[in-house]
């Protein structure tokens, strides 16, 4: 009764197509698969950024796999062949592991890379990234930003840099078609006459860094003798109403009365007949139904009612 063995996949490698972190893992079938012609061989692939505690694991019949990685660190991957139990009279057979690694050969010391990278997707329309210069670099150092997301043929360089002291310290992006809900990859590298500059890699999803415009058209409506309804409108732009959360700050007679978070464009407030002045401001943020994270808008313009009887039917300004 001979023991069934299978070889690991051949030519296992990690290929960098130049997409700033989106890499291809690929391999060829193992040698000597002739005995298992009727069998569909599977592969178990494990991979991670070096330093990560956990491996991602994929079982596939394909000869390739694609995923995003942090190119600030190295990547390690291993793969073995699986023969399902149907092929081997009852027990799954695994090959030994084939292993490979990949890393970008770093230039320059870590301190020279950009600091404080900050990207904001304003009103789900305009992406702006800014950074501070690396340490130990001279004012002649120039930084360049490249970006890629699925749908672009190749990585693109920023064409509209923000400059300070003659250095590129930010990028205003063009219109980014079909770019949300997918990984967005950025590399900022640099050049200097006196020393090499370390590249920096960043990955995020645009819907998670949206800063909306503030709400507009704030109004008051008297609902009853002791209730006032505060209303506002969503700002102009592509963000649908269902995607907003709001924070309201209400001030009654120069005292902060209420801070509240609500999911729609109204808030009902209990008042007393003694109230002489009522002011409120609102700000907005993309909610958990449309993103995993977000940035609060600026506060709206303040809307106040003062110097008249708040018992009037409708209070508009």
């Amino acid at each position: 009764d001979t023991e069934i063995k299978v070889n690991p996949p051949q030519d296992f490698e990690i290929v960098d197509p130049g997409y700033l972190g989106y890499l291809y893992l690929q391999w060829q079938p193992p040698l000597s698969l002739d005995h298992f012609k009727e069998c569909t061989v599977e592969y178990e692939l494990k991979y991670r950024n070096i330093g990560s505690e956990t491996w991602k694991t994929i079982i596939t019949k394909n000869l390739h796999y694609k995923d995003g990685f942090d190119l600030n660190k190295g990547i390690e991957a291993k793969i073995h062949t699986l023969l399902p139990w149907q092929c081997t009279n009852g027990s799954e057979v695994q090959s030994s592991w084939a292993e490979t690694t990949y890393w970008i050969s770093p230039q320059g010391i870590p301190e020279t890379k950009v600091q404080d990278m900050d990207c904001v997707y304003y009103n789900w329309q305009y992406l702006l990234c800014s950074w501070k210069p690396g340490i130990g670099v001279l004012l002649d150092t120039n930084y360049n930003l490249f970006y890629w997301y699925e749908g672009l043929d190749h990585a693109l360089q920023c064409v509209d840099y923000i400059k300070a002291d003659g250095q590129n310290i930010g990028c205003r992006f063009p219109y980014l078609e079909a770019s949300d809900y997918k990984d967005f990859y950025i590399c900022v590298n640099g050049s200097s006459e006196n020393k090499p500059i370390r590249s920096s890699y960043f990955t995020f999803q645009l819907q998670n860094i949206v800063k909306p415009l503030p709400p507009v058209y704030l109004t008051f409506t008297r609902e009853s003798s002791c209730e006032i309804k505060l209303k506002w409108s969503i700002p102009l732009g592509p963000i649908p109403a269902r995607c907003f959360d709001y924070e309201i700050e209400i001030r009654e007679d120069d005292t902060t009365l209420v801070t509240a978070t609500v999911e729609n464009e109204t808030y009902t407030l209990k008042t007393t007949n003694e109230t002489r002045q009522l002011c409120f401001v609102v700000r907005s943020k993309v909610n958990i139904y449309c993103s995993d994270d977000g940035i609060w808008s600026e506060w709206s313009d303040k809307q106040c009612w003062e110097g008249e009887d708040l018992s009037k039917k409708t209070l508009l300004r």
Partner: nanobody, 116 residues
Framework: QVQLKESGGGLVQAGGSLRLSCVAS????????MGWYRQAAGKQRELFAS???????VYAGSVKGRFSISKNNAENTLYLQMDALRPEDTAVYYC??????????WGQGTQVTVST
């Protein structure tokens, strides 16, 4: 308008210490990134220490372990404590503030001279 004013420079012997200050006004100091640059005679201005709004610091290898950057948000002041000074530390020292994505502000500089 934004103003940055450095002080504390001077002549010191090798191995000695100096403490530079940079008093800021005209912007929200607590939320700004701040850096110290220096420019030796005939050379370009070089960033050698920085501190973020949250207080994270980074140093160039040439000053690590000898220089310390800090800030006092209540007093709108950036500091640079310089110990074990060397002749190659001789330069004009500049304070740099970057309170937003697009603005960079400079002080007028203070001369530090380290003699042997």
């Amino acid at each position: 308008q934004v103003q940055l004013k450095e002080s504390g420079g001077g002549l010191v012997q090798a191995g000695g210490s100096l403490r530079l200050s940079c008093v800021a006004s005209g912007f929200t100091f607590s939320s700004a990134w701040m850096g110290w640059y220096r420019q030796a005679a005939g050379k370009q201005r070089e960033l050698f220490a920085s501190i973020t709004s949250s207080g994270d610091t980074v140093y160039a290898g040439s000053v690590k372990g000898r220089f310390s950057i800090s800030k006092n948000n209540a007093e709108n002041t950036l500091y640079l404590q310089m110990d074990a000074l060397r002749p190659e530390d001789t330069a004009v020292y500049y304070c740099n503030a970057r309170p937003g994505a697009v603005n960079s502000y400079w002080g007028q500089g203070t001369q530090v001279t380290v003699s042997t």
